[in-house]
Amino acid sequence: QEGKFSGPLKPMTFSIYEGQEPSQIIFQFKANPPAVTFELTGETDNIFVIEREGLLYYNRALDRETRSTHNLQVAALDANGIIVEGPVPITIKVKDINDNRPTFLQ
């Protein structure tokens, strides 16, 4: 049974509030042999990172004004650097910090 924040390589969408603390874990991808490493491409803006073992996280607070949606691709590679699975689309939607707290002009 895979947990809520871990699982196989498949297309996914995540919503993240802008301005949140960086270095937050988004998802842990699990490799199926012979896949041993993961690779992230697309609109990473050097913010999104995937570790070889499949841990996807972001290392800077997101800014919705800069980019409201990040279209990424994740692939699983074998020991020879050849793609075994993917690349699959991973969509990161950046949510407005004010979405849940509407303010009204007087």
């Epitope: 012979p34 692939a75 020991a79 020879n80 075994v84």
Partner: antibody, heavy 120, light 107 residues
Framework: QVQLQQSGRDLVKPGASVKISCKAS????????INWVQQRPGQGLEWIGW????????YYNEKFKGKATLNVDKSSSTAYMLLSSLTSEDSAVYFC?????????????WGQGTTLTVSS | DIQMIQSPSSMFASLGDRVSLSCRAS??????LDWYQQKPGGTIKLLIY???NLNSGVPSRFSGSGSGSDYSLTISSLESEDFADYYC?????????FGAGTKLELR
């Protein structure tokens, strides 16, 4: 020097099986992958799959699953490809090629090819 | 599967000519492309690996370039032993796929 010596030409009947060999010399057999490639008459090259002699692990092109079976005999540094349920479509030249393990995975040495003819 | 389209399928050239052979992938392959030469006798030899790296023992008149999905092999000055079939191979993703080949013939 590195050499891959393949078995000679084969003439077999439809429905039969055949085992093609590829004897490696001049390097440590268990450190490199052995790839197999098909070339039909007058056609291009098609990758069948690889075997890593060090562990015996294999990876097949889906198209050849059930048709080709790869194995090795480490004691004689020989790789084998068994082709089963042969039809005229399997008539081709089959090459073995050494694959450098890790990245980049290029095929730096090739066997001379084994011609297989399937005919009744 | 990634399709590899080679062009031209055949070409005629003369000794001393500079020729370029093309290989286009159906999607980006991150430079994971090799070039092989097959002589009329069937012998296959690695020329270039990873787009532009010359295999040891291969004459410097051979060179490779490209990125994304478009790649090429150039022979700067044809010699008699260069008339052969040339194949590109992508090893970016399984299954590994070859182009259909370019036959280089003496004019």
């Amino acid at each position: 020097q590195v050499q891959l010596q393949q078995s000679g030409r084969d003439l077999v009947k439809p429905g039969a099986s055949v085992k093609i060999s590829c004897k490696a010399s001049g390097y440590t057999f268990t450190d490199y992958h052995i790839n197999w490639v098909q070339q039909r008459p007058g056609q291009g090259l098609e990758w069948i799959g690889w075997i890593f002699p060090g562990s015996g692990s294999t990876y097949y092109n889906e198209k050849f699953k059930g048709k080709a079976t790869l194995n090795v005999d480490k004691s004689s540094s020989t790789a084998y490809m068994l082709l089963s349920s042969l039809t005229s479509e399997d008539s081709a030249v089959y090459f073995c090629a050494r694959g450098k393990s890790g990245y980049p995975f290029y095929f730096d040495y090739w066997g001379q090819g084994t011609t297989l003819t399937v005919s009744s | 599967d990634i399709q590899m389209i080679q062009s031209p399928s055949s070409m005629f050239a003369s000794l001393g000519d500079r020729v370029s052979l093309s290989c286009r992938a159906s999607q980006g392959i991150r430079g994971n492309l090799d070039w092989y030469q097959q002589k009329p006798g069937g012998t296959i030899k690695l020329l270039i690996y990873s787009t532009s790296n010359l295999n040891s023992g291969v004459p410097s008149r051979f060179s490779g370039s490209g990125s994304g999905s478009d790649y090429s092999l150039t022979i700067s000055s044809l010699e008699s032993e260069d008339f052969a079939d040339y194949y590109c191979l992508q090893r970016n993703a399984y299954p590994l796929t070859f182009g259909a080949g370019t036959k280089l013939e003496l004019r």
